[in-house]
């Protein structure tokens, strides 16, 4: 006999990285017929929603109108059908950005390189932080973490066309409080390759949609938000 229901999906819209004072919605998708959803923050009950009518709703939204460092942290949700509770969702790491300062991102040997060339990004921030994060724009969240007193090195190693795209970096004051994003750096990888199988390019968003992460299909939603959850967990723990 089943003692718990399947865990719900949790994600943030438009993104898990939220500029301070901006709004964010935490979404929790369980099952039709769920009579109650609970949102937990840092292990404690944060909010409750009881959808009406439950048999026609399988998703609830928890709205945060004004993001700040107190609201940043780890969220999870659970739902109940009758007396039976679900497993808790994966943890969602909600990050507040645009704190304090703006780092500088550079890439060596340059923003245009040849396939196979070794590339290193440098993220520099003169204020007190020792953790830096490099992110590539696009559906799949390519995130690297680096450390240094005022600058972190992010070696990409020999690059392929899959590394093409727009990169930004952040300084991190703690796991859930990040600086303003750096100016974007677009990496262009050129090169005619013979007898080499390369990874396909990642779909990337135009620079002006940075920070918006909108998906249309429920399947895509579930898959990609699970990916975001997974990325956030790996990144922030």
């Amino acid at each position: 006999q089943q003692q718990t229901l399947p865990k719900p999906f949790i994600w943030a819209e438009p993104h898990f990285m939220v500029p301070k004072e901006k709004q964010v919605t935490i979404c929790c998708q369980g099952n039709y017929g769920a009579v109650e959803y609970q949102l937990h923050f840092e292990g404690s009950l944060f909010a409750v929603d009881r959808p009406k009518p439950p048999e026609r709703i399988n998703k609830v939204k928890f709205y945060i109108p004004d993001m700040n460092s107190r609201m940043a942290g780890q969220y999870s949700c659970i739902y109940r059908v009758g007396e039976l509770w679900s497993e808790p969702s994966n943890l969602l790491d909600l990050v507040v950005t645009e704190m304090y300062d703006t780092p500088t991102l550079s890439v060596h040997p340059g923003p245009e390189v040849i396939s196979g060339e070794k590339v290193t990004f440098y993220c520099r921030l003169d204020t007190a932080t020792s953790m830096f994060l490099l992110l590539k724009e696009g559906r799949s969240s390519h995130v690297q973490r680096g450390y240094g007193k005022v600058q972190a090195e992010f070696p990409l190693g020999p690059v392929t066309t899959a590394h093409r795209g727009t990169y930004r970096c952040f300084g991190s004051y703690n796991n859930h409080a990040w600086s303003f994003p750096s100016e974007p750096v677009k990496l262009l990888v050129t090169g005619d390759i013979e007898n080499t199988s390369l990874a396909p390019e990642d779909p990337t968003f135009p620079a002006d949609t940075w920070g918006t992460y909108l998906l249309t299909t429920e399947t895509g939603l579930q898959k990609d938000h699970a990916l975001w959850d997974h990325t956030a967990q790996n990144l922030l723990r």
Partner: antibody, heavy 116, light 107 residues
């Protein structure tokens, strides 16, 4: 110490080809791209193209695409630049240069003279 | 392609004096600008990378500055061996391009 040693001077007829070599030592050959730059007599520097020896990725100046072929042999740590359909304007000193961000090390240069 | 323009074409300065060489890019190249020195019959030699970063083994009298489109190479006090041709190079975008050179001659 890093050294790039190029092959000797060449005299070629118009319409023919020349292949210049550049043997690298003192560093891991596959970790840096190798580029070719030429300098006509009394003129400035002109980039021809470059290669990433580890997977053979190349990039060319459009001006030379189709005429220049850059290759690399990892087993001998040697890069090559072949230029075909030579004309008198190709008379120049040809340099190989390692790209460590900038061109941090250069070969001694190979003089190619194209004359009928 | 990014066009690099150096000025002046020739600069006449006395030993011991300061020399200032300019390089302008046709579009912004951030700090992806490198400086080289070339003497007759020799290969170019790297002096400054990324606009202002010094190179091991290069005398401290050589310094670079600038960002975006305008760059400067300064030689604080000229030595006899500094009289040569100087080139700037765009390291930002392919094709990699060089300025036409500034010839530094003894006044």
């Amino acid at each position: 110490q890093v050294q790039l040693v190029q092959s000797g001077a060449e005299v070629k007829k118009p319409g023919s080809s020349v292949k210049v070599s550049c043997k690298a030592s003192g560093y891991t050959f596959s970790e840096y791209t190798m580029h070719w730059v030429r300098q006509a007599p009394g003129q400035g520097l002109e980039w021809i193209g470059g290669i990433s020896p580890n997977i053979g990725g190349t990039s060319y100046n459009q001006k030379f695409k189709g005429r220049a072929t850059i290759t690399a042999d990892k087993s001998t740590s040697t890069a090559y630049m072949e230029l075909s359909s030579l004309r008198s304007e190709d008379t120049a000193v040809y340099y190989c240069a390692r790209r460590g961000g900038s061109f941090d090390y250069w070969g001694q240069g190979t003089t190619v003279t194209v004359s009928s | 392609e990014i066009v690099m323009t150096q000025s002046p074409a020739t600069l006449s300065v006395s030993p011991g004096e300061r020399a200032t060489l300019s390089c302008r890019a046709s579009q912004s190249i951030s700090d992806y600008l490198h400086w080289y020195q070339q003497k007759p019959g020799q290969a170019p030699r790297l002096l400054i990378k990324y606009a202002s970063q010094s190179i091991s083994g290069i005398p401290a009298r050589f310094s670079g500055s600038g960002s975006g489109t305008d760059f400067t190479l300064t030689i604080s006090s000229l030595e006899p061996e500094d009289f040569a041709v100087y080139y700037c190079q765009n390291g930002h975008s392919f094709p990699l391009t060089f300025g036409q050179g500034t010839k530094l001659e003894i006044k």
